[in-house]
């Protein structure tokens, strides 16, 4: 499936606390729902790999092609 | 407590050219899409455009395509907003709101007012 | 451009009356919709995202639903300091706002 990585941005929509990430900006869950198609504006967010909604933060995921790394899949990953 | 306060907004003569301040505190800034939201006198809201986190992924509105550019700098917690030849129509409030999407938290806003 | 019309654009209520406005999507937009209130002078505030789930902090009587082209903000029973304008927002393509509903007292 790639390398699975997480955008920054949280709208801190379903956190106990507002100021910070509810989820950890390095993690992944892999449990069904958690996701759903990204908006059609971010279609051209991730550069190398597919774009995935956290539809508990409502902010875009990218799943990064083999060999590329980074929150957009941006960086080929120099250790691939 | 998360506050974004804009600043910079002013009288200007239509061609002209403004730019927009928006210092963020309470929140980790530097992991935030942030975006510029307007609202003409009496009028709607309307989205003017956003940035991510990083400032490597930028859209606009077309009604300010080519005219306003949106920056950032992580370093200073600030968001930027150049807006270039001015019209009468882009008169109004203009607010930065935390998020790409949606928008969960909102400055007090700064009037801009494109007359001659 | 996806386009977002509310309806109506301005309604008359009393307190602990029930409230309905509904935002209709000019393309199909899944659940990609929010809700903020607006009172005037004020920034806006987020009620209601992805359609139908509360943001943290607002009250229960505000619920929302609707999927697809169709989505309906309702308050259970008004407040007086619900009296206010309503904006429903897309963010499927990019973000765009319906012209908003104005609440105003009976």
């Known amino acids: 499936d790639g390398n699975s990585t997480r955008s920054p941005e949280t709208n801190g929509l379903l956190c106990g606390d507002p100021e910070e990430n509810c989820a950890a900006t390095t993690t992944q869950s892999k449990r069904k729902g958690h996701f759903s198609r990204c908006p059609k504006q971010y279609k051209h967010y991730c550069i190398k790999g597919r774009c995935r909604f956290v539809v508990a933060e409502q902010t875009p995921s990218c799943v990064c092609d083999e060999g590329y790394i980074g929150a957009r899949c941006e960086r080929v990953d120099l250790f691939y | 407590q998360v506050q974004l306060l804009e600043s910079g907004g002013g009288l200007v003569q239509p061609g002209g050219s403004l730019r927009l301040s928006c210092a963020a505190s309470?929140?980790?800034?530097?992991?935030?899409?942030i975006s510029w939201v307007r609202q003409a006198p009496g009028k709607g809201l309307e989205w003017v455009s956003y940035?991510?986190?990083?400032?490597?992924?930028?859209n606009y509105a077309d009604s300010v395509k080519g005219r306003f550019t949106i920056s950032r700098d992580n370093s200073k917690n600030t968001l930027y907003l150049q807006m270039n030849s001015l019209r009468a129509e882009d008169t109004a409030v203009y607010y930065c709101?935390?998020?790409?999407?949606?928008?969960?938290?909102w400055g007090q806003g700064t009037l801009v007012t494109v007359s001659s | 451009d996806i386009q977002m019309t509310q309806s109506p654009s301005s309604l008359s209520a009393s307190v602990g009356d029930r409230v309905t406005i509904t935002c209709r999507a000019s393309?199909?937009?899944?659940?990609?919709l929010g809700w903020y209130q607006q009172k005037p002078g004020k920034a806006p505030k987020l009620l209601i995202y992805?359609?139908?789930s509360l943001q943290s902090g607002v009250p229960s009587r505000f619920s929302g639903s609707g999927s697809g082209t169709d989505f309906t903000l309702t308050i259970s029973s008004l407040q007086p300091e619900d009296f206010a304008t309503y904006y429903c927002?897309?963010?499927?393509?990019?973000?765009?706002f319906g012209q908003g509903t104005k609440v105003e007292i009976k």
């Open positions: 309470g929140f980790t800034f530097s992991r935030y899409w």
């Open positions: 940035i991510d986190s990083t400032g490597t992924f930028i």
């Open positions: 393309q199909g937009i899944i659940s990609y």
């Open positions: 709101a935390r998020g790409g999407s949606l928008f969960d938290y």
């Open positions: 927002q897309q963010y499927d393509a990019l973000n765009t």
């Open positions: 992805a359609a139908s």
